[in-house]
């Protein structure tokens, strides 16, 4: 039960995280105009990974795409690449994790296969989250560097009479969305990896068989002295699979291994 919950929660958290990474990548507000030195500006500038926008106080917003590829800063290209890699890995991870979910039945898929898929998706989510966090952090670092560079030569002018205010940019909403989304994807991935441990059956060199005497139903396990007295409907011989971390009531509820997914 705890495994299913952990896996399900990991999936949901990762799903939210990847949706957030996609949203952040598409958002125009990666950097927004710093209004500290000019809070009365009627024109507001903001930039994304794909285009830059200007919102006039009339409400008129004009956005221009970066139609050049070679003319863009290498750092911006790197951020784009990291975010796209994060999205692709996250999307594949989501696809894999859907089939790995314990609550979904797909033919007669073994627990071990589900465990492997869960681990794979978990690793993908972790890498996806790290890509997003790295991408956002690289962009943030770029902003900080440019901010202080533009602060150093903020005002230029003719004899101090005319001021030319250089537009400075600060952290936009997309950065915070990206950090949070990357973090969620990372957490979701870790949860999937934890769930994988609970799904993976332990390696056993034997098949446990229960032998039932006519009177007291006693289960004898080769190589072990642990016996359990059985009462109730457990009259027919059946294989007991001891592998895997599962509770006693789970064993009773799901007696056949083919009932597991």
């Amino acid at each position: 039960m705890a495994v299913t919950a952990c896996q399900g929660l990991g999936f949901v958290v990762s799903l939210i995280g990847i949706a957030g990474i996609i949203a952040a990548t598409c958002m125009d507000q990666w950097s927004t105009q710093d209004l500290y030195n000019n809070p009365v500006t009627a024109v507001f500038n903001y930039q994304g990974l794909w285009r830059s926008c200007v919102r006039e106080s009339s409400g008129f917003t004009e956005c221009r795409g970066y139609f050049t590829l070679l003319g863009l800063p290498a750092m911006l290209q790197a951020v784009r690449a990291l975010m796209i890699v994060g999205i692709v890995l996250g999307a594949i991870g989501l696809l894999v994790s859907i089939f790995a979910l314990k609550c979904i039945r797909i033919g007669s898929m073994e627990d071990s296969a589900k465990a492997n898929m869960t681990l794979t998706s978990g690793i993908m989510f972790i890498v996806s989250g790290l890509c997003a966090i790295a991408g956002v952090s690289v962009f943030a670092n770029m902003l900080v560097t440019n901010f202080w560079m533009s602060t150093a030569n903020m005002y230029t002018g003719m004899g101090g009479m005319v001021q030319t205010v250089q537009t400075r940019y600060t952290f936009g909403a997309a950065l915070f969305v990206g950090w949070v989304a990357g973090g969620l994807t990372l957490i979701g991935g870790v949860m999937m990896c934890i769930a994988c441990r609970g799904l993976a059956p332990e390696e056993t060199n034997y098949k446990a068989v229960s032998y039932h005497a006519s009177g007291h139903s006693v289960a004898y396990k080769p190589g072990g002295f642990k016996a359990s007295t059985g009462f109730g409907s457990n009259t027919k011989n059946k294989k007991i699979y001891d592998g895997g971390a599962r509770t006693e009531d789970e064993v009773q509820s799901y007696p056949s291994k083919h009932d597991y997914v």
Epitope: N38, T41, V54, S57, G59, F60, E62
Partner: antibody
Framework: QVQLQQPGSELVKPGASVKLSCKAS????????MHWVKQRPGQGLEWIGM????????NYNEKFKSKATLTVDKSSSTAYMQLSSLTSEDSAVYYC????????????WGQGTTLTVSS | DIVMTQSPSSLSVTAGEKVTMSCKSS????????????LTWYQQKPGQPPKLLIY???TRESGVPDRFTGSGSGTDFTLTISSVQAEDLAVYYC?????????FGSGTKLEIK
């Protein structure tokens, strides 16, 4: 077509208050900022402030913040500017102007209300 | 506040002449985000409200004759009337559209001889 109707004139006593109106027609009133501009006789233009009819959001020239209050009545598509504690310095022509959407310049202006403050 | 300085304060020309008037701002009106200059030119004829002529320093408002041309960038702007007509008798104002409060120049009065 777009029209901004303003009363031709208002005569008020010093110390009193007045509420100037600007009735808009021919466009979606709530989509455009409404500006108010002051022009004293034989003088230049002074921007008082602006209001967005949809949100009621305002932006004032600091100089007029304690003098003017901008409001709107969406149901009648009318913008108002209340001027308080009137003095002879407030005697002027007051224009309302609609914000041009492709730029931040007003493109439609009312004919203006001539406010006379006299005892 | 941005101070707008217009010169000359008045001009007297004959019909058909070319006219140039200047407007200087105390701070740059050039927005780096879109490389547009947020300066507007208005024409105000006697007894009438101002009329928008040019916005973004050089973009003519629809319906404005092409004899009106706006130019300049940063802090120095110019309005040129290539061939003055009798109906151009008016006061011409430049306005800062970049920063609150929106400020106007004192105006250039154009008179026809």
């Amino acid at each position: 077509q777009v029209q901004l109707q303003q009363p031709g004139s208002e005569l008020v006593k010093p110390g009193a208050s007045v509420k100037l109106s600007c009735k808009a027609s021919g466009y979606t009133f709530t989509s455009y900022w409404m500006h108010w501009v002051k022009q004293r006789p034989g003088q230049g233009l002074e921007w008082i402030g602006m209001i967005h009819p949809n949100s009621g959001s305002t932006n004032y020239n600091e100089k007029f913040k304690s003098k003017a209050t901008l409001t709107v009545d969406k149901s009648s598509s009318t913008a108002y500017m209340q001027l308080s504690s009137l003095t002879s310095e407030d005697s002027a022509v007051y224009y309302c102007a609609r914000r041009y959407y492709g730029s931040i310049s007003p493109d439609y202006w009312g004919q203006g209300t001539t406010l006379t403050v006299s005892s | 506040d941005i101070v707008m300085t217009q010169s000359p304060s008045s001009l007297s020309v004959t019909a058909g002449e070319k006219v140039t008037m200047s407007c200087k701002s105390s701070q740059s009106l050039l927005n780096s985000g879109n490389q547009k200059n947020y300066l507007t030119w208005y024409q105000q004829k006697p007894g009438q409200p101002p009329k928008l002529l040019i916005y973004w320093a050089s973009t003519r408002e629809s319906g404005v004759p092409d004899r009106f041309t706006g130019s300049g960038s940063g802090t120095d702007f110019t309005l040129t009337i290539s061939s003055v007509q009798a109906e151009d008798l008016a006061v011409y104002y430049c306005q800062n559209d970049y920063s609150y409060p929106f400020t106007f120049g004192s105006g250039t009065k154009l008179e026809i001889k």
